[in-house]
């Protein structure tokens, strides 16, 4: 007779012992259940201590399950971040290596005497891509100004060019366009390409950060009670074989994860914006084409300067006066042959296409992560009954589960029959993460339009707390400019999880 068999508590002993608890707590046979504080108070195989132990265990198991699901998502995002980051850095490093290999032959001392300036430019581009708070247009303008000073001196070794003359040269430069169209073209293309690349990688970093922080949000006491009732009260009440009813499980977890579900809208917006910005990876102003070809714009610029030298010199003299001649200086620099370099458009390697198609597919797969979490955990971790029949555990006994399934999110839990949720008290950590998602989405939308949000007067209404710990070293506070020291708002996010490779020793 099954009823008499359940009265012996044998199965409960087995399950309880398997969890690592002491069997000395377990009654040999059912006892009266007035002492129970979570489970229904019928005859029971659980003492108060057992109920408390199982409640703590069920709470820990749910948190572990939640962390496991989050870890899978985090790992996917981290892998994507690493792959894209490697690819973008590889493009820039390749361009610098090509420059170092080809410029000495193409330009001689015009390059070798200015190698430091070129190295600095690539370092700045690298830092910018990695989330440093520097203004890319200003950095490029600064590079061209320094380069012009140095090359003008090199092309005119017979002239005395004191600092005040070079200052005048600098003031004339914009009107003179000494490097032809290359600086303007590089500025327009590089700004769009670098902004797109860095915001996409930052988006992956922010998404990963949000998942990590949300996974650490503790489940409240009301949730603990409901999960205990869902998972272990059937054992205590002598029906250990009864699996939870699917809708009952969903209501418990929708109540427990109500705040997490509120991430859904902004999470989708972020992933949509990330998918959208991958459009900017293609074409002549695309990431691959531009980042991998910085050196060709630099070569074009030096060639233009050499070609325009005489006109330029005449105009500079017109604007700045006749410089003194150095009687002991050599004659004017001989015109060098034009530096021949590979064509500007890099043929796409196929690597980026593959990365993007994989990323799009994976981002689509996790779009509904937050609202599907209750269902996922119920089906994968809770050993549910296969059907909503009258043999499943409904929280009170074996039988049909009658209440309707709640909607998603905090507001929809107002009448959740399983978890008492205070819908007037949203979780602050999760609110902060929603704000981080919004900020990153705005950044991606700006980037899609070719704008760097960090250098517009955008007043994000984030508190600055939350997920803003991704800054590397002091990148987020540093500015770069010789000519201006304008104060800028620090980034909320650099690239989380990437190690900085700065300050390399060279000799």
């Amino acid at each position: 007779d099954p009823a008499s068999k359940s009265r012996s508590c044998g199965e409960v002993r087995q399950i309880y012992g398997a969890k690592g608890f002491s069997l000395s707590d377990v009654p040999q046979a059912e006892i009266s259940g007035e002492h129970l504080r979570i489970c229904p108070q019928g005859y029971t195989c659980c003492t108060s201590e057992m109920e408390e132990n199982l409640a703590n265990r069920s709470h820990a198991e749910l948190e572990t399950a939640l962390r496991d699901s989050s870890r899978v998502l985090q790992a996917m995002l981290a892998t994507q971040l690493r792959s894209f980051d490697d690819h973008f850095q590889h493009l820039l490093n390749d361009s610098e290596r090509t420059l170092q290999a080809t410029f000495p032959g193409a330009f001689g001392e015009l390059y070798t005497q200015n190698a430091r300036a070129f190295r600095d430019l690539y370092s700045e581009l690298r830092l910018y891509y990695r989330g440093a708070n520097l203004h890319l247009e200003e950095t490029l303008a600064e590079f061209w100004a320094r380069l012009l000073e140095r090359l003008f001196k090199q092309l005119h070794p017979q002239l005395l060019l004191p600092d005040d003359y070079l200052d005048c040269l600098g003031k004339q430069a914009e009107a003179l366009r000494p490097f032809g169209e290359a600086p303007r073209e590089l500025r327009l293309r590089a700004t769009r390409a670098f902004v797109a690349a860095r915001s996409f990688v930052q988006g992956l970093g922010v998404a990963s950060d949000v998942v990590r922080k949300v996974a650490q949000v503790p489940l409240g006491p009301e949730c603990s009670r409901a999960v205990m009732k869902l998972v272990y009260c059937a054992h205590c009440l002598g029906v250990p074989g009864a699996r939870p009813c699917p809708d009952y499980c969903r209501n418990v977890l929708k109540g427990c994860l109500a705040n997490q579900a509120d991430l859904d809208a902004e999470w989708r917006n972020l992933l949509d914006s990330m998918v959208l910005i991958t459009d900017k990876f293609w074409g002549t102003s695309g990431v691959e084409s531009v980042i991998g070809s910085v050196h060709t714009w630099l070569a074009e610029a030096i060639n233009a300067l050499q070609d325009n030298r005489d006109t330029l010199t005449a105009k500079v003299i017109q604007g700045c006066g006749n410089p003194k001649v150095n009687p002991q200086g050599p004659g004017p620099e001989e015109k060098r042959r034009r530096g021949k370099l590979a064509p500007r458009e890099r043929p796409p390697s196929g690597t980026l296409e593959k990365l993007v198609s994989e990323a799009k597919a994976q981002l689509r797969d996790v779009q509904d992560f937050w609202i599907s979490l209750p269902g996922t955990l119920c089906s994968e971790k809770m050993a549910l009954s296969t059907a909503s029949d009258d043999r499943c555990w409904n929280g009170m006994a074996r039988g049909r589960y009658l209440p309707e399934v709640m909607g998603d999110g905090l507001a929809n839990q107002i009448n959740n029959p399983e978890v008492e949720v205070d819908i007037t008290k949203p979780d602050m950590t999760i609110r902060q993460q929603i704000m981080q998602l919004k900020i990153m989405t705005n950044r991606l939308r700006s980037a899609y339009n070719g704008n760097d949000v960090d250098f517009q007067d955008a007043s994000d209404d984030g508190s600055g707390s939350g997920s803003g710990d991704g800054c590397l070293d002091d990148l987020c506070s540093r500015k770069v400019s010789r000519k201006s020291s304008s104060s800028r708002t620090p980034l909320t996010h650099a690239l989380p999880g990437l190690s900085e490779q700065e300050g390399q020793k060279t000799s």
Partner: antibody, heavy 119, light 107 residues
Framework: QVQLVQSGAEVKKPGASVKVSCKAS????????MHWVRQAPGQGLEWMGE????????TYNQKFKARVTMTRDTSTSTVYMELSSLRSEDTAVYYC????????????WGQGTLVTVSS | DIVMTQSPSSLSASVGDRVTITCRAS??????LAWYQQKPGKAPKLLIY???NLQSGVPSRFSGSGSGTDFTLTISDVQAEDFGTYYC?????????FGQGTRLEIK
């Protein structure tokens, strides 16, 4: 006006390390290279290396490469020079010096920091 | 490394004299040469850059010339405050190197 203020004198034992600081003010810190130059008592000037405060990139004199580390802190506009495995011949005045413009010429100098290495 | 050789290693002059110090580079450095003055217990002070440009605030009695490998610093009308040690330095490329110095004493 441009000012470079260095940390005070140090006395160190052979084998120890020393870290000298140089705090910059009066200009945009990240806009100019900073160099370290040393001068042993009664001797000439010896260039040790340079740091780009904007990127943190460094170039060291081969003679010191294994023992010197230059770093910067942009939040305080300070550069640092650390010299390890000190020996008595490292006793010298250590100067930080800022470039005039992007030209390897030292227009502004710190007041110097005397490092004495003695057992 | 580019070796910078200064001569003489020391000299003494009277107020009003014209003094010349020379500096030779072991390889061509175009006009990438600077001159500094250092007084005892003080940091060096930039006098001349790019071989012949006078640094702002430096008296016009100081002048520099030369290009390639041979350079000179001239003080046309030596004053009592000009005593000290003078160094040349090549700014052509790293490692930056200095001459060994020329000590100027005022008679």
């Amino acid at each position: 006006q441009v000012q470079l203020v260095q940390s005070g004198a140090e006395v160190k034992k052979p084998g120890a390390s020393v870290k000298v600081s140089c705090k910059a003010s009066g200009y945009t810190f990240t806009g100019y290279y900073m160099h370290w130059v040393r001068q042993a008592p009664g001797q000439g000037l010896e260039w040790m290396g340079e740091i780009n405060p904007s990127t943190g990139d460094t170039t060291y004199n081969q003679k010191f490469k294994a023992r010197v580390t230059m770093t910067r802190d942009t939040s305080t506009s300070t550069v640092y020079m650390e010299l390890s495995s000190l020996r008595s011949e490292d006793t010298a005045v250590y100067y930080c010096a800022r470039e005039k413009r992007d030209d390897g010429v030292f227009a502004y100098w710190g007041q110097g920091t005397l490092v004495t290495v003695s057992s | 490394d580019i070796v910078m050789t200064q001569s003489p290693s020391s000299l003494s002059a009277s107020v009003g004299d014209r003094v010349t110090i020379t500096c030779r580079a072991s390889q061509g450095i175009r006009s990438a040469l600077a001159w500094y003055q250092q007084k005892p217990g003080k940091a060096p002070k930039l006098l001349i850059y790019d071989a012949s440009n006078l640094q702002s605030g430096v008296p016009s009695r100081f002048s520099g010339s030369g290009s390639g490998t041979d350079f000179t610093l001239t003080i046309s009308d030596v004053q009592a405050e000009d005593f000290g040690t003078y160094y040349c330095q090549q700014s052509f490329g790293p490692p930056r190197t200095f001459g060994q110095g020329t000590r100027l004493e005022i008679k």
